[in-house]
């Protein structure tokens, strides 16, 4: 039960995280005009990964896409790549994890296969989250560097006569969305990996013992519990003698009202 909950929660948390990563990637407010200690402008500038926007005091907003690839800063390209890789890995992870969910039965899929799929999706979520966090952090670092550079040259002029006020940019909402979303995806991935350990059935670390009763011979291979050592193959425990207790996995495998067929 705890394993199913952990897996389900991991899936939901990752789903929210990936939705957040997609939202952050699409958002225009990665960097926003710094309004503190700046001349009061009648426009508000903000920029995303794909376009830059200007909102005028009238409320009129105009956005222009970056219609060039080669002309863009390498850092921006790197951030784009990291976010896209994060989304792709996260999407594949979600697809894999849907089939790995314990509450969903697909044919006669072995628990070991579900465990492997859970682990795979977990790793994908972790990498996806890390990509998002890395992408957002690289962009944030770029902003901080540019902020202090523009602060140093805030007023550049020709002989001190004509002044050009440089627009300084600070952290936009998308950065915080990205950090939180990346963190959630990472946490979801870790939860999936933890769930994988609980899902994987393991054989005991010792051989079957033969008991000789007076009436008839029965070979009993212990399978009513799981070995706690963590070793052994991931094949499903089979009982030669049918009178023993069911394994934990077998108890769960019977259809219930919560199952989705």
């Amino acid at each position: 039960m705890a394993v199913t909950a952990c897996q389900g929660l991991g899936f939901v948390v990752s789903l929210i995280g990936i939705a957040g990563i997609i939202a952050a990637t699409c958002m225009d407010q990665w960097s926003t005009q710094d309004l503190y200690n700046n001349p009061v402008t009648a426009v508000f500038n903000y920029q995303g990964l794909w376009r830059s926007c200007v909102r005028e005091s009238s409320g009129f907003t105009e956005c222009r896409g970056y219609f060039t690839l080669l002309g863009l800063p390498a850092m921006l390209q790197a951030v784009r790549a990291l976010m896209i890789v994060g989304i792709v890995l996260g999407a594949i992870g979600l697809l894999v994890s849907i089939f790995a969910l314990k509450c969903i039965r697909i044919g006669s899929m072995e628990d070991s296969a579900k465990a492997n799929m859970t682990l795979t999706s977990g790793i994908m979520f972790i990498v996806s989250g890390l990509c998002a966090i890395a992408g957002v952090s690289v962009f944030a670092n770029m902003l901080v560097t540019n902020f202090w550079m523009s602060t140093a040259n805030m007023y550049t002029g020709m002989g001190g006569m004509v002044q050009t006020v440089q627009t300084r940019y600070t952290f936009g909402a998308a950065l915080f969305v990205g950090w939180v979303a990346g963190g959630l995806t990472l946490i979801g991935g870790v939860m999936m990996c933890i769930a994988c350990r609980g899902l994987a059935p393991e054989e005991t670390n010792y051989k079957a013992v033969s008991y000789h009763a007076s009436g008839h011979s029965v070979a009993y291979k212990p399978g009513g519990f799981k070995a706690s050592t963590g070793f052994g193959s991931n094949t499903k425990n089979k009982k030669i003698y049918d009178g023993g207790a069911r394994t934990e996995d077998e108890v769960q495998s019977y259809p219930s009202k919560h199952d989705y067929v």
Epitope: Q33, V40, A42, V43, S58, T164, Q166
Partner: antibody, heavy 120, light 113 residues
Framework: EVQLVESGGGLVQPGGSLRLSCAAS????????IHWVRQAPGKGLEWIAY????????YYADTVKGRFTISRDNAKNSLYLQMTSLRAEDTAVYYC?????????????WGQGTTVTVSS | DIVMTQSPDSLAVSLGERATISCKSS????????????LAWYQQKPGQPPKLLIY???TRASGVPDRFSGSGSGTDFTLTISSLQAEDVAIYHC?????????FGQGTKLEIK
């Protein structure tokens, strides 16, 4: 047809108060920011205040800050300028002007103006 | 505050001739976010309120004859009337539309020679 009509001007003594009104018609008033601009006799134009469409953003010129208050009532399609502690240098024709939606913040329509004379 | 300086203060041009008014700002009116200039030109005829002629330094407002044109970028701007008509006699004002307080030039009086 877009129309802005100012009213409330007149003769007032130094230190006195006056409230100017601007009645708007011919457009959706609540969709536009509005400015007050004045022009002293024989002088150039001087921007004095701005209020955004939802009254969330208000700006004043330093010369009137603390003395003048801009406000609006979108339900009545009206703009107001409450002027206190009036000085002789506040004597001017006061215009209300609409901030254009896609005119790079330029004022696309102006009222005919109302005259304020501050004199003892 | 941004200081807007117009030149000349007054200008007399013959009918049908070209009239050029200059406007300089103390700071660049070019917004880096969209590479647009936030400068407007207004025409004010005697006893009338100003009328918007040009916005964004070079875009004609609706209903403005095409003999009026605006140019320039950053700090230097120009209003040109390609062929002066009698009805163009007025005072012309330039205005900073980028920084608050919004500021106007002192105005240029255009007359017929």
């Amino acid at each position: 047809e877009v129309q802005l009509v100012e009213s409330g001007g007149g003769l007032v003594q130094p230190g006195g108060s006056l409230r100017l009104s601007c009645a708007a018609s011919g457009f959706t008033f609540s969709d536009y920011g509005i400015h007050w601009v004045r022009q002293a006799p024989g002088k150039g134009l001087e921007w004095i205040a701005y209020i955004s469409r939802g009254s969330s953003t208000i700006y004043y010129a330093d010369t009137v800050k603390g003395r003048f208050t801009i406000s609006r009532d979108n339900a009545k399609n009206s703009l107001y300028l409450q002027m206190t502690s009036l000085r002789a240098e506040d004597t001017a024709v006061y215009y209300c002007a609409r901030g254009g939606y896609d005119t790079r913040n330029a004022m696309d329509y102006w009222g005919q103006g109302t005259t304020v004379t501050v004199s003892s | 505050d941004i200081v807007m300086t117009q030149s000349p203060d007054s200008l007399a041009v013959s009918l049908g001739e070209r009239a050029t008014i200059s406007c300089k700002s103390s700071q660049s009116l070019l917004n880096s976010g969209n590479q647009k200039n936030y400068l407007a030109w207004y025409q004010q005829k005697p006893g009338q309120p100003p009328k918007l002629l040009i916005y964004g330094a070079s875009t004609r407002a609706s209903g403005v004859p095409d003999r009026f044109s605006g140019s320039g970028s950053g700090t230097d701007f120009t209003l040109t009337i390609s062929s002066l008509q009698a009805e163009d006699v007025a005072i012309y004002h330039c205005q900073n539309d980028l920084y608050y307080p919004l500021t106007f030039g002192q105005g240029t009086k255009l007359e017929i020679k």
